[in-house]
Interface confidence: low
C-alpha cells in the first residue's frame, strides 16, 4: 500500500499557502483528486510529488494515490481544507442526474472542518426541503439525498452558518429521472367486439408510463387512424387515451384494431377484431358425442357451447323423456361465460339412475330466435341372468334371459358337480350362442334375449350355468338338475352394480 | 393369473401433486372397476373412489372431489390416481383394487406417498 | 372416525373358535352386503368374504361370515398362527354413495 506525506488524514491550509503532497510506493504511483488549478505534479520511479504555490478554496478534496501494479489494489488518500472565510464550500458539479431510489450525492465540499456544525441543505431562494426528503452530510463529500425520488428534481443550495449569518454555496441541480421499466402498459377495450350493421360502437385504446416521454395510436387494418389524445396524470403515471367512436358501423369498420405504444424502451401493441354483422346471430355447439352412452352409477356432464349477439335473453335444459317427467335440477345446471360472445352451460347427471337416461335437450333464445342442441343418453348395465327349464315341443329346454346394455353374448356351460358356478376344472362343455334372439330391444331400455339349449335327458350330478357378459360387466345363473325337479341358483351378487 | 403393479414410492413437499399408476395384467382391464383405497401408517383403510375403464367414468368419496384425478389408458391396461394440493396428513400407502362396484377382488402390492416439508 | 365399528383387537389360542362383529347403519350394512378383507402385516388387503357369506376361491372354509339387520360377523374356527392379521369390514353406503370400512381389528394369536 502506498505512503503519503504528511501521514495525515485531514490537511488545514490558508488560501495562497504551498501545499506539497509526496506518495511513496513499490512500484509506480498515480494521484488522483478533483479538478483543480496550481496543481504541479512530479514523478520519479515510485514515489509523485503533487504540489502548489497558491492553494485555493478550488483545492479543496481528497486526493488519492494508487499503485497501479498492486495486485491488491491499495491506495492512500488525504483530505485538503483550504479554509478561506469568504468561500466555505467547494462545488465539483453544478448538475448531479440520478435514477429513482438511487442516493443522490450532492458535491459541495466544506472548505474549513469547523464549519460542519452549522451546515445545511436547503433548495434555492431559501426554500425548505420537500417534506420526507432524507439527506446525510460529510465534510469530504457533500450532502447525500437518499433514495432519491423523481418530485426531489429541484436545485439546491448547501448552506453554512458563518459569524451568525448562512452563507450558500453556488446552485446545484439534481435531475432525478423515473426508471423507465419497459415499453408503455396498453390497454385496448374491448378485446373482441360484434356488432349489427347501423349499430354504434366505441374503441379504447390507452398507454401509460412512469415517464411523459412515449407515443400511441390505434390502427385499423394497418392504416393509422387520426383520433385526438386525452392525456392524464394519475397514481403516479402519465396515461394518453384514444377514443373511437362510430355512430353507425358498416362492413368497412371491421377487421382487426391495433393499439401501439412506444418509448425510449421499446413497443408494446396489442390487437382486437370487430365483427360487422348482418342480423342477431345464435349457434349451440358441443365438443361431446350428442349420442352418449354411461354405465348405470356414474356420472356425466353434458356440455354446450353457445356463441351469440345480442346476449342471451333466456335458456334451459329440458329433459324430453322418455322414462319420467321430471326435469333437471336447476342446482345441476352450471353456465360459465369465456368471453363476451361465448359461453358455456354444463348439465351435471351424478350416478345417473335407470329412469335418467333419454333425450335432454338445451334451449337458448335472443333477438335471433330460439335454437336447441339435443343429447341422447343411453346407459350401460351389465347383464342380468336367469334360467328355467322348460319343454319346447316335447324336447326339454333350458332357457336362458339375458338382459343388459349392450347387448349381452351368451355361453352355456355343463360341469361337473353341484356348483354355484362352474370352475375351468370342472367344466365338460361349453356352447356359444352366436344368434340369442333378442326378445326386446327399444331405445334406452336394456336389450333382453334368450337363449336355448335343447338337453335331452338332464344329468343329474351335473350343472349348467348361462353365463352373459358384454363390455359393462358379466352375469351368470347355475341349473342344478335334482330329482325332485330343478333347482335353479342366481349369481352369489358377485356382480352386483347400482 | 391377476396381477396389478403399482409405481414406487414418492416424496413431495406440502401444495405439490402426485401420480400413481397401476397396471393391470392377467384379465380383461376394461371389464372390471378399479378402485383407490389408501391407508396411513398405523391406520385404517380408506376409500378414495373408482374409475370405470371402460367408459372413463370415475366417482370419488367426497373428502376428495376437487383433489383426486382417476384416468386410465386402455391401451397399456393402467390405471392413475392423481392426487393435488398435498398436505402432511395425505402420508400413506395408496393401493389400487380390480372389483365390482362394492368390493375389491384383487390389490396392487401399495405406493407409499410421504408428504413432508 | 370409521362408518362402520369393530372391535379393535380380538386374541385366541390356536384351534379356537373367534368371532370379529361389525356393526352399520340401514344406509351401509342394512341396505347391501357386507365384505371382508385380510391383511397380513406388511402387504396388501385381500378379500376374504363377499357378499356376506360368500368365499372367493382359495380362502379356507374356516372363514365364514353371516349378517343380520343392520350388523355382520367373520367367525374363524380352527384358529392358526397365519390367521394373525388385520381383519376389516366394508360396505357401500347409500347416502355416502362410496365404500366404507371399519376401522379394522387386530387378531393376535396367542
Known amino acids: 500500500i502506498p505512503v503519503i506525506e504528511p501521514s495525515v488524514p485531514e490537511l488545514v491550509v490558508k488560501p495562497g499557502a504551498t501545499v506539497t503532497l509526496r506518495c511513496v510506493g513499490n512500484g509506480s504511483v498515480e494521484w488522483d483528486g478533483p479538478p483543480s488549478p496550481h496543481w504541479t505534479l512530479y514523478s520519479d520511479g515510485s514515489s509523485s510529488i503533487l504540489s502548489t504555490n497558491n492553494a485555493t478554496f478550488q483545492n479543496t478534496g481528497t486526493y488519492r494515490c494508487t499503485e497501479p501494479g498492486d495486485p491488491l489494489g491499495g491506495s492512500a488518500a488525504i483530505h485538503l481544507y483550504v479554509k478561506d472565510p469568504a468561500r466555505p464550500w467547494n462545488v465539483l458539479a453544478q448538475e448531479v442526474v440520478v435514477f429513482e431510489d438511487q442516493d443522490a450525492l450532492l458535491p459541495c465540499l466544506l472548505t474549513d472542518p469547523v464549519l460542519e456544525a452549522g451546515v445545511s441543505l436547503v433548495r434555492v431562494r431559501g426554500r425548505p426541503l420537500m417534506r420526507h426528503t432524507n439527506y446525510s452530510f460529510s465534510p469530504w463529500h457533500g450532502f447525500t439525498i437518499h433514495r432519491a425520488k423523481f418530485i426531489q428534481s429541484q436545485d439546491y443550495q448547501c448552506s453554512a452558518l458563518m459569524g451568525g449569518r448562512k452563507v450558500m454555496s453556488i446552485s446545484i441541480r439534481l435531475k432525478v429521472q423515473k426508471v423507465i421499466p419497459g415499453p408503455p402498459a396498453l390497454t385496448l377495450v374491448p378485446a373482441e367486439l360484434v356488432r349489427i350493421r347501423g349499430e354504434a360502437a366505441q374503441i379504447v385504446c390507452s398507454a401509460s408510463s412512469v415517464d411523459v416521454n412515449f407515443d400511441v395510436f390505434l390502427q385499423h387494418n394497418n392504416t393509422k387512424l387520426a383520433i385526438p389524445q386525452q392525456s392524464d396524470f394519475h397514481n403516479n403515471r402519465y396515461q394518453k387515451v384514444l377514443t373511437l367512436n362510430l355512430d353507425q358501423v358498416d362492413f368497412q369498420h371491421a377487421g382487426n384494431y391495433s393499439c401501439v405504444a412506444s418509448n425510449v424502451q421499446g413497443k408494446h401493441s396489442t390487437s382486437m377484431f370487430f365483427r360487422v354483422v348482418e342480423s342477431a346471430y345464435l349457434n349451440l355447439s358441443s365438443e361431446q358425442n350428442l349420442i352418449q352412452e354411461v354405465t348405470v352409477g356414474e356420472g356425466l356432464n353434458l356440455k354446450v357451447m353457445v356463441e351469440a349477439y345480442p346476449g342471451l335473453q333466456g335458456f334451459n335444459w329440458t329433459y324430453l323423456g322418455p322414462f319420467s317427467d321430471h326435469q333437471p335440477e336447476p342446482k345441476l345446471a352450471n353456465a360459465t361465460t369465456k368471453d363476451t360472445y361465448r359461453h358455456t352451460f354444463t348439465l351435471s347427471l351424478p350416478r345417473l339412475k335407470p329412469s335418467e337416461a333419454g333425450r335432454y335437450s338445451f334451449l337458448a333464445r335472443n333477438p335471433g330466435g330460439w335454437r336447441a342442441l339435443t343429447f341422447e343418453l343411453t346407459l350401460r348395465y351389465p347383464p342380468e341372468v336367469s334360467v328355467i327349464w322348460t319343454f319346447i315341443n316335447g324336447s326339454g329346454t333350458l332357457l336362458c334371459a339375458a338382459s343388459g346394455y349392450p347387448q349381452p353374448n351368451v355361453t352355456w356351460l355343463q360341469c361337473s358337480g353341484h356348483t354355484d358356478r362352474c370352475d375351468e376344472a370342472q367344466v365338460l362343455q361349453v356352447w356359444d350362442d352366436p344368434y340369442p334372439e333378442v326378445l326386446s330391444q327399444e331405445p334406452f331400455h336394456k336389450v333382453t334375449v334368450q337363449s336355448l339349449l335343447t338337453v335331452e335327458t338332464l344329468e343329474h350330478n351335473q350343472t349348467y350355468e348361462c353365463r352373459a357378459h358384454n363390455s359393462v360387466g358379466s352375469g351368470s345363473w347355475a341349473f342344478i338338475p335334482i330329482s325332485a325337479g330343478a333347482h335353479t341358483h342366481p349369481p352369489d351378487e358377485f356382480l352386483f352394480t347400482p | 393369473q391377476v396381477q396389478l403393479v403399482q409405481s414406487g414410492a414418492e416424496v413431495k413437499k406440502p401444495g405439490a401433486s402426485v401420480k400413481v399408476s397401476c397396471k393391470a395384467s392377467g384379465y380383461t382391464f376394461t371389464g372390471y372397476y378399479m378402485h383407490w383405497v389408501r391407508q396411513a401408517p398405523g391406520q385404517g383403510l380408506e376409500w378414495m373412489g373408482w374409475i370405470n375403464p371402460n367408459s372413463g367414468g370415475t366417482y370419488c368419496a367426497q373428502k376428495f372431489q376437487g383433489r383426486v384425478t382417476m384416468t386410465r389408458d386402455t391401451s397399456i391396461s393402467t390405471a392413475y390416481m392423481e392426487l393435488s394440493r398435498l398436505r402432511s396428513d395425505d402420508t400413506a400407502v395408496y393401493y389400487c383394487?380390480?372389483?365390482?362396484?362394492?368390493?375389491?377382488?384383487?390389490w396392487g402390492q401399495g405406493t407409499l406417498v410421504t408428504v413432508s416439508s | 372416525q370409521s362408518v362402520l365399528t369393530q372391535p379393535p383387537s380380538a386374541s385366541g389360542t390356536p384351534g379356537q373358535r373367534v368371532t370379529i362383529s361389525c356393526s352399520g347403519s340401514?344406509?351401509?350394512?342394512?341396505?347391501?352386503?357386507v365384505n371382508w378383507y385380510q391383511q397380513l402385516p406388511g402387504t396388501a388387503p385381500k378379500l376374504l368374504i363377499y357378499?356376506?357369506?360368500q368365499r372367493p376361491s382359495g380362502v379356507p372354509d374356516r372363514f365364514s361370515g353371516s349378517k343380520s339387520g343392520t350388523s355382520a360377523s367373520l367367525a374363524i374356527s380352527g384358529l392358526q398362527s397365519e390367521d394373525e392379521a388385520d381383519y376389516y369390514c366394508?360396505?357401500?353406503?347409500?347416502?355416502?354413495?362410496?365404500?366404507?370400512f371399519g376401522g379394522g381389528t387386530k387378531l393376535t394369536v396367542l
Open positions: 366394508a360396505a357401500w353406503d347409500d347416502s355416502l354413495n362410496g365404500v366404507v
Open positions: 383394487a380390480r372389483g365390482r362396484l362394492t368390493f375389491f377382488d384383487y
Open positions: 340401514s344406509s351401509n350394512i342394512g341396505s347391501n352386503t
Open positions: 357378499s356376506n357369506n
